[in-house]
Interface confidence: low
């Protein structure tokens, strides 16, 4: 999916105001010096690129965050702010139904979510300083 | 490793044309505003062009408005400067310069080639 | 068109503290960048948006900008340290990039 064509402001708006809150409560007992960050974006349409995989395509290690909160928030931001975005993810979200899986938090999804983290505080720099 | 390699560069006279190309590897190209910097022989450091990351957008110093070009091409991970109607004060060193792409706001230089040297001389 | 000016040498000895300054009308309310230039080399970034620094750049080095004056500063000074530090910014009146004139770090 190409998401260029974003409402970014909103999308910002909806990390700022939930998603954010539920990726810390996440992450809570975790120091924040644990996980270097390894992952980066240098644009906006680029950061959801990588939200995205990271946030929903299960890696080796980490096959549950897809239903945490965090999660499901962040796709219906997705959903209402990118044209065209749900229609693109129906098959996944059916073939994710067929795969679920008993919660675990690992130290893998401690890490991914580390990383998730940092994406959005990039997603999120100011553009310019206040004049 | 990432890396981004000018080539292009000579002597050329006044008036003459020269191309200019950057080679990039080792990171997303297509996701990164691109920019020249130029630095003549003993002085500072001059900023030239940028064209964003989907090339949607160019920005020229005013030394060389209308006489230069820039452009990229993603798919092969190549930017370049066409120079028309070259001076002698156009004589520097020209840096291809990458930047995180941001709306309207410029980012931080963070990744340089090592430069090529144009002379522009009689 | 906006401009920044640098002091054009600054001389300081090993184990001090090197104080540099970029002025700019405002300048506080953009997003300044430094560079390090040794001689016959590229320009390497070593402080970022006012004041943060890429992993590689040792903690020495710092940065601060308000008012009209953007700061680098470099502590416990090392001979490695001497070479030129330009300032940068985005002028987004003109949709321009904007060096300052460069300032040459001497270690005594």
């Known amino acids: 999916y190409d998401f260029t064509n974003c409402d970014f402001e909103k999308i910002k708006a909806a990390y700022l105001s939930t998603i954010s809150k539920d990726l810390i409560t996440y992450m809570s007992g975790t120091k924040s010096t644990e996980f270097n960050n390894t992952v980066s974006c240098s644009n906006r349409p680029h950061c959801l690129t990588e939200i995205q995989s990271l946030t929903f395509n299960p890696t080796a290690g980490c096959a549950s965050l897809a239903k945490e909160m965090f999660a499901m928030k962040t796709k219906a931001a997705l959903a209402i702010w990118c044209p065209g975005y749900s229609e693109t993810q129906i098959n996944a979200t059916q073939a994710m139904k067929k795969r679920r899986k008993r919660k675990v938090t690992t130290n893998k999804c401690l890490e991914q979510v580390s990383q998730l983290q940092g994406l959005w505080r990039r997603f999120n720099r100011p553009l310019l300083k206040q004049q | 490793q990432m890396q981004l390699v000018e080539s292009g560069g000579g002597v050329v006279q006044p008036g003459r044309s020269l191309r200019l190309s950057c080679a990039a590897s080792g990171f997303a190209f297509r996701t990164y505003g691109m920019h020249w910097v130029r630095q003549a022989p003993g002085k500072g450091l001059e900023w030239v062009a940028v064209i964003w990351y989907d090339g949607s957008a160019t920005h020229y110093a005013d030394s060389v408005k209308g006489r230069f070009t820039i452009t990229r091409d993603n798919s092969k991970n190549t930017l370049n400067l066409q120079m028309n109607s070259l001076r002698a004060e156009d004589t520097a060193v020209y840096y291809c310069?990458?930047?995180?792409?941001?709306?309207?706001?410029?980012?931080?230089?963070?990744?340089w080639g090592q430069g090529t040297m144009v002379t522009v001389s009689s | 068109s906006y401009v920044l000016t640098q002091p054009p040498s600054v001389s300081v000895a090993p184990g001090q503290t090197a104080t540099i300054t970029c002025g700019g009308n405002?300048?506080?309310?953009?997003?300044v960048h430094w560079y390090q230039q040794k001689p016959g080399q590229a320009p390497v970034l070593v402080v970022y948006d006012d004041s943060d620094r890429p992993s590689r750049i040792p903690e020495r080095f710092s940065g601060s900008n308000i008012g009209n004056t953007a700061t680098l500063t470099i502590s416990r000074v090392e001979a490695g340290d001497e070479a030129d530090y330009y300032c940068q910014v985005w002028d987004h009146s003109s949709d321009h990039v904007v060096f300052g004139g460069g300032t040459k770090l001497t270690v005594l």
């Open positions: 310069v990458r930047a995180p792409q941001w709306y309207l706001s410029a980012e931080a230089f963070d990744l």
């Open positions: 405002l300048i506080g309310s953009k997003l």
